[in-house]
């Protein structure tokens, strides 16, 4: 008799999930020699232990603590780039500006980037059919709790000037419900962080508006100021030129506004 299985509204665990996590861990330690003390088998075991045999709507940050401990990593606290709804450009930027880091440039972020996973209560099986959707099912699901945990820790570690890349093409340039708006903003430490500098990325070729005056940016400024952190904002009118100028700062066309 086929066993009844809970049907969730979200996509199931990414295929080859265990193999992918393990392979990513090994790759990461290969290209980041300072992390070669990490035992990737233990990392996978801790990752698995956070959600296997647990109800996928009942996951806590505590479940991920063994993994957090194994993945402890020191990144320069003054070189942190946060992002919201513009992941690809943020990653292209840190790929060129090698001394800056997004969460996905750290081991734990790299391991889980773009993956989905969940288990089932009281069975050691991984659910490849469906996983809980944050809105339709529950917020305390394995994926959401993971990102909340690592994002909080990442923001807590930041110091001096913290940069955030925001998508100027969206109706809410700053969204209070995003991971940045709901987790990272509230976990920057005022005693360590002097300034949050927002980079608003323009989408249209001819878009010359000052998106730093957008109401949602003003809302972000208000939240940050109330936390005793200074706020500054820059328009990035031409993201393609911006990246090119990061690559080749001495280019004569890079002195003008980008």
């Amino acid at each position: 008799v086929p066993r009844w299985r809970q049907q969730w509204s979200g996509p199931g665990t990414t295929k080859r999930f265990p193999e992918t996590v393990l392979a990513r861990c090994v790759k990461y330690t290969e290209i980041h020699p300072e992390m070669r003390h990490v035992d990737c088998q233990s990392v996978w075991d801790a990752f698995k232990g956070a959600f296997i045999s647990k109800h996928p709507c009942n996951i806590t940050e505590e479940d991920y603590q063994p993994l957090m401990k194994l993945g402890t990593q020191t990144v320069p606290c003054n070189k942190i780039l946060l992002w919201s709804r513009i992941k690809d450009l943020a990653h292209q930027f840190t790929q060129v500006q090698r001394d800056m880091f997004t969460l996905e440039d750290t081991l734990l972020g790299y391991l889980a980037d773009d993956l989905t996973w969940c288990g089932e209560f009281n069975t050691s099986k991984i659910n490849y059919q469906s996983c809980p959707d944050w809105r339709k099912d529950c917020s305390n699901n394995p994926v959401s709790v993971f990102w909340k945990t690592v994002s909080r820790r990442f923001a807590e570690a930041a110091c001096d000037v913290v940069h955030v890349m925001l998508n100027g093409s969206r109706s809410k340039i700053f969204d209070k419900n995003s991971t940045f708006g709901s987790v990272e903003v509230h976990n920057l430490q005022p005693e360590k962080v002097q300034t949050l500098e927002a980079w608003v990325i323009h989408g249209g070729r001819e878009d010359s508006r000052d998106l730093c005056q957008d109401p949602t940016i003003k809302e972000l400024e208000s939240i940050i100021s109330k936390r005793n952190i200074q706020f500054s904002c820059k328009n990035i009118y031409r993201p393609d030129k911006f990246l090119q100028c990061v690559k080749n700062p001495e280019d004569s066309s890079c002195t003008s506004e980008i």
Partner: antibody, heavy 123, light 112 residues
Framework: QMQLVQSGAEVKKTGSSVKVSCKAS????????MHWVRQAPGQALEWMGW????????DYAQKFQDRVTITRDRSMSTAYMELSSLRSEDTAMYYC????????????????WGQGTLVTVSS | DIVMTQTPLSLSVTPGQPASISCQSS???????????LNWYLQKPGQPPQLLIY???TRAAGVPDRFSGSGSGTDFTLKISRVEAEDVGVYYC?????????FGQGTKLEIK
């Protein structure tokens, strides 16, 4: 079985570019970093850079930073190394290579190599 | 960059006799994980290099046990207990402790 098969020999003019391919088979292409190493005639081996085939992220040796571009086509399980502004000193055998995994640890040695692609640069 | 220096640059050995190649690194290759990131390769004429030894002393799959690697943080040795005709070629040491990985200039082994 695991194989890295490279494109054929090339003869190029000074100042032009060359693009060498490396087709992987017998393993999951995105699971391993791909490295490129070159060897000029009678010279030692020289590491050029790596690509993570899953994300497309790269890192290059300082010496080649301005002239080399490593890319990949995931659907073809193929990595590419393009070298621009060729000079006579770039005449060399170009290899793609990857490590072996020893019980979930990268060995740190290039255990698998392509057969090599000879690039000759002439004026 | 870490500089790798090999000695001798060439070596002529009678079959059945032992051979020894030295390699020195400009910095210690011992990682905090306890592994020493020093590799040895043999490149036979017209072929790509083949990995012989990794982590200073671990033989790669399929490598005969007449090959052995030893050393400390900066001084390393590849020993062949009894040289065979098929061992001819150029031997390279390589560090993979940090990027860029760097190779020694090579030691050419010939049969007398």
């Amino acid at each position: 079985q695991m194989q890295l098969v490279q494109s054929g020999a090339e003869v190029k003019k000074t100042g032009s570019s060359v693009k060498v391919s490396c087709k992987a088979s017998g393993y999951t292409f995105t699971d391993y970093i791909m490295h490129w190493v070159r060897q000029a005639p009678g010279q030692a081996l020289e590491w050029m850079g790596w690509i993570d085939p899953e994300y497309g992220s790269t890192d290059y040796a300082q010496k080649f930073q301005d002239r080399v571009t490593i890319t990949r086509d995931r659907s073809m399980s193929t990595a590419y190394m393009e070298l621009s502004s060729l000079r006579s000193e770039d005449t060399a055998m170009y290899y793609c290579a990857r490590v072996a995994i020893i019980t979930t640890v990268a060995s740190g040695g290039f255990a698998y190599w392509g057969q090599g692609t000879l690039v000759t640069v002439s004026s | 960059d870490i500089v790798m220096t090999q000695t001798p640059l060439s070596l002529s050995v009678t079959p059945g006799q032992p051979a020894s190649i030295s390699c020195q690194s400009s910095e210690s290759l011992l990682h905090s994980n306890g592994k020493t990131y020093l590799n040895w390769y043999l490149q036979k004429p017209g072929q790509p290099p083949q990995l012989l030894i990794y982590w200073m002393s671990t033989r790669a799959a399929g490598v005969p046990d007449r090959f052995s690697g030893s050393g400390s943080g900066t001084d390393f040795t590849l020993k062949i207990s009894r040289v065979e005709a098929e061992d001819v070629g150029v031997y390279y040491c390589q560090q993979f402790l940090e990027y860029p990985p760097t190779f020694g200039q090579g030691t050419k082994l010939e049969i007398k």
